[in-house]
Each structure stands twice: as C-alpha cells, then as structure tokens.
C-alpha cells in the first residue's frame, strides 16, 4: 500500500511522517538552531533507531539539537527531554557542550561555537 | 508552504516526489534488481544532482541501476537510457559491468555478482 508523507516544507525529506533537511552552509550551534527555528523546525532530535533508521546512512558530521548540561552531567534535547540510554554512542573528541550527529547513531561532542553543517527536523 | 510527498510505499523515504529505500541485506546486482522490481520499483537511477541532492550525503556503497554495455562501451540505466555526462564520477576499482552508488555522486565499478546493499527508487 502506498501513502503520502508529510506535510513537510517544500523540498524537505519526508520519512515516517517526519521532515528532515540537511543544510550545507556551516554555522555554529546557535546559528544552526536559529536557522531551523526560522523554518518552523528544530535541530535534529534522535528519538528512535527504528523510526529514524535513515540516519544510519548519513555521511559526515552535522549539528543536532543535543546539548550538555554541565550542572547535572546529562545530555538533553532542545525541547528539554533527556537523551534516552543506548540511542546514541557519545564520543568526546574534545571538550564541548554541543553534539554533532554522525552515521550509525553516533554523537560527537564539539565546541558549540565551531561552524558545522546541520540537520533540521520537523515532526508532523 | 508545506506539502505532502508521494505517494510512496509504506516507510520509504520521499524526496521531491521520488521514493527511495535503502536495503541492508547484501545481494548481487541481479538479486537487488529483482528485489526492487518485486516492490514495483527499480534500482536507483541518478538523473539530477539538484533533484536528488539528498544522495550526496549517503554513506557507504550500494547497488544502483547502472550497467556497462560491453558492445558499445556505454553505461546505461535499467530503463535503457544512457548515463548523462557529468552526473556521476565513474571510478573503476576493479573489472565489472555494474556500478555501486557512493556519496557525492560517485559510481564505483564492481563485479555484478558481488553482494552489496542496494537502493531502490520509485518515481511518482
């Protein structure tokens, strides 16, 4: 059975009724977040390996909406929810409080002010 | 403006009204082609860097629907159309008549009987 996916912003990727877009321009985490917000979206939130299995094949490194809260040592998403255990393998290449998404559900810790490409997501 | 994408088979990726699916199981080119056909689709056809720019971020190597015609030395798609110039960078890693898609619009020549993952595509 075939079905429609969305709705999504024009020319975004639609998968399992979520919308994704990969942006080529390099911005720091805060600028990336602002860019997504201006498009009525947020930086990528990884919430399910099954529902988001397209992400396992993503090449390179891209800002996602995950930030480190130094006061309690946790990682949380822009919406305030805590990173679920076993969803991402967190890798600390350097000190930082923001995270880049990399293929196969890995999160690379990075300084939030470093420019990187980014992934926006809109949940429908 | 937001819009719906598709229609596509359930749980396929929809992008610019084309449907894509990445299959994890390794099959040779012929088995991969048969798998796509059984789902009313074909192996990936690359026809536009603009309309298919999601492909630039694909990690790893996957069978696509491109085959070498030894009699005239050309590369053509399953539908018989000839590979357009400048669409793919063809890289001859070894002797073969089938091609794997790799990120940034590269095609790697491979023996058709070698098992690989594959990408199916359905144009709406």
């Amino acid at each position: 059975t075939e079905s429609y996916c969305g709705p999504c912003p024009k020319n975004w990727i639609c998968y399992k009724n979520n919308c994704y877009q990969f942006f080529d321009e390099s911005k720091n985490w805060y600028e990336s977040q602002a860019s997504c917000m201006s498009q009525n979206a947020s930086l990528l939130k990884v919430y399910s390996k099954e529902d988001q299995d397209l992400l396992k094949l993503v090449k390179s490194y891209h800002w996602m909406g995950l930030v480190h809260i130094p006061t309690n040592g946790s990682w949380q998403w822009e919406d305030g929810s805590i990173l679920s255990p076993n969803l991402l393998t967190i890798i600390e290449m350097q000190k930082g409080d923001c995270a880049l998404y990399a293929s196969s559900f890995k999160g690379y810790i990075e300084n939030c002010s470093t420019p990187n490409t980014y992934i926006c997501m809109q949940r429908t | 403006t937001e819009s719906y994408c598709g229609p596509c088979p359930k749980n396929w990726i929809c992008y610019k009204n084309n449907c894509y699916q990445f299959f994890d199981e390794s099959k040779n080119w012929y088995e991969s082609q048969a798998s796509c056909m059984s789902q009313n689709a074909s192996l990936l056809k690359v026809y536009s860097k603009e309309d298919q720019d999601l492909l630039k971020l694909v990690k790893s190597y996957h069978w696509m629907g491109l085959v070498h015609i030894p009699t005239n030395g050309s590369w053509q798609w399953e539908d018989g159309s000839i590979l357009s110039p400048n669409l793919l960078t063809i890289i001859e890693m070894q002797k073969g008549d089938c091609a794997l898609y790799a990120s940034s619009f590269k095609g790697y020549i491979e023996n058709c009987s070698t098992p690989n993952t594959y990408i199916c595509m359905q144009r709406t």
Epitope: N72, S74, P85, I90, I91, M93, Q94, K95 | -
Partner: antibody
Framework: QVQLQQSGPGLVQPSQSLSITCTVS????????VHWVRQSPGKGLEWLGV???????DYNAAFISRLSISKDNSKRQVFFKMSSLQANDTAIYYC??????????????WGQGTTVTVSS | DIQLTQSPAILSVSPGERVSFSCRAS??????IHWYQQRTNGSPRLLIK???ESISGIPSRFSGSGSGTDFTLSINGVESEDIADYYC?????????FGAGTKLEIK
C-alpha cells in the same frame, strides 16, 4: 573545601561482597557526578563506573554484572557495592569527583582510597 | 576499549631539568586526554585536562600538548617534590581507560 572521605572494610572473604561509602563535602551530589576507580599492581588504574548527579549510572562492561553504585544526596553519600569478589579484586578503591568540564570523565578531586584485600 | 601506552616506564632526571612523558592512544581521541600525578601512598591528583588545559593550583612548570593519538606531559624544571607516578587517562568514550604510568625518579 572539596573533600571525598571513604569508609569500608579492609578485608573481604572470597565470593563475598564489598561495600564502600564515599562521603563528600564542599560540593553537592545534585550537581556533580562521582566516579569509582580501582588500582592494583597487576592491572594499574581501572575505571569501574560513575553515578551522575541526576542519579543514573554507567558501568564498565567488565564489571556491570556485579557492580552497583547508588547515593543519598541529602546525606552527601555515595555507595559502592561489588559482589562475588575474588583474589584478583584486591586493590585500592577510589571515589573521585567528575568535574564540570566535558562529558565523560575529568576527575578533579579524589578520595583517600580504601585498601581492599580479598582473602580467606 | 581504547588502550593508552605510556613511555618510558621509568624516567630518571636531575633537578632543574626539563622532562617529558609520552602517552599514545590506540585510536584518535582528539584532545580528550588528562594527566594525573600520584605520589607514594597518595591519591591521584589532576595536573592537566584536555591535553593542554592548566589546572588551578598546579605549578606552571607542568604543561601538556598533543592531539589525535600522541600526547606529552612536560615538567619544565623538575623539583624533588615531583617524584611520583604520572598517568594519562582518556575520556573519548566508555570505558574510561588509563595508561600504565611512568615513574619519575630524581638522580
């Protein structure tokens, strides 16, 4: 000032459990995580596990089946328990504070250590 | 697990000399390396974090450098109180691991 004070038995019978308490002062367990590390002549320093300020834990996979770390924030105490000890678990056991820098583990203050001998 | 190899096992220097400790990781770990000093019968003490960042209260003669797989701790002008074991530790990924240590001796 920041201090971590450890208390626990020096001698443990083979197959028995080890319990150590780490009592902290100069900082709050609701804000800082606490790591556990042991040191033996044979294996050097080995990271065992951590309890985060929020109460969740992460363990070294080599010890996950017999290790438990818990805490009581109001008493400023962290509790370490390891079961089924054998002679090769003889070591000095340390608690240490996880600094705010980075995610995983910069240990900026350490307890005095608890020397544990496993013997009958 | 990430292995950390420290060399040499023992360093013997004269007071006032500059000394360097090496730590090599089995894979690239960026700058996620930290250095500790442990004096005889004492607990480890943090000297350097994230390869090169200094720690409040640690004498300025201690410094660190490196990234990727090769890291160095240096003491510029060794003093007798520096007699100790020195360990590197990585925080790139679980489990956290330590090097086997280098013992500093004074001639």
């Amino acid at each position: 000032q920041v201090q971590l004070q450890q208390s626990g038995p020096g001698l443990v019978q083979p197959s028995q459990s080890l319990s150590i308490t780490c009592t902290v002062s100069g900082f709050s367990l609701t804000i800082y995580g606490v790591h556990w590390v042991r040191q033996s002549p044979g294996k050097g320093l080995e990271w065992l596990g951590v309890i985060w300020s929020g109460g969740s834990t992460d363990y070294n996979a080599a010890f996950i089946s017999r290790l438990s770390i818990s805490k009581d924030n109001s008493k400023r105490q962290v509790f370490f328990k390891m079961s089924s000890l054998q002679a090769n678990d003889t070591a000095i056991y340390y608690c240490s504070r996880k600094s705010h820098d980075g995610y995983y583990g910069v240990m900026d203050y350490w307890g005095q250590g608890t020397t544990v001998t496993v013997s009958s | 697990d990430i292995q950390l190899t420290q060399s040499p096992a023992i360093l013997s220097v004269s007071p006032g000399e500059r000394v360097s400790f090496s730590c090599r990781a089995s894979q690239s770990i960026g700058t996620s390396i930290h250095w500790y000093q442990q004096r005889t019968n004492g607990s480890p003490r943090l000297l350097i974090k994230y390869a090169s960042e200094s720690i409040s209260g640690i004498p300025s003669r201690f410094s660190g450098s490196g990234s990727g797989t090769d890291f160095t701790l240096s003491i510029n002008g060794v003093e007798s109180e520096d007699i100790a074991d020195y360990y590197c530790q990585q925080s790139n990924t679980w489990p956290l691991t330590f090097g086997a240590g280098t013992k500093l001796e004074i001639k």
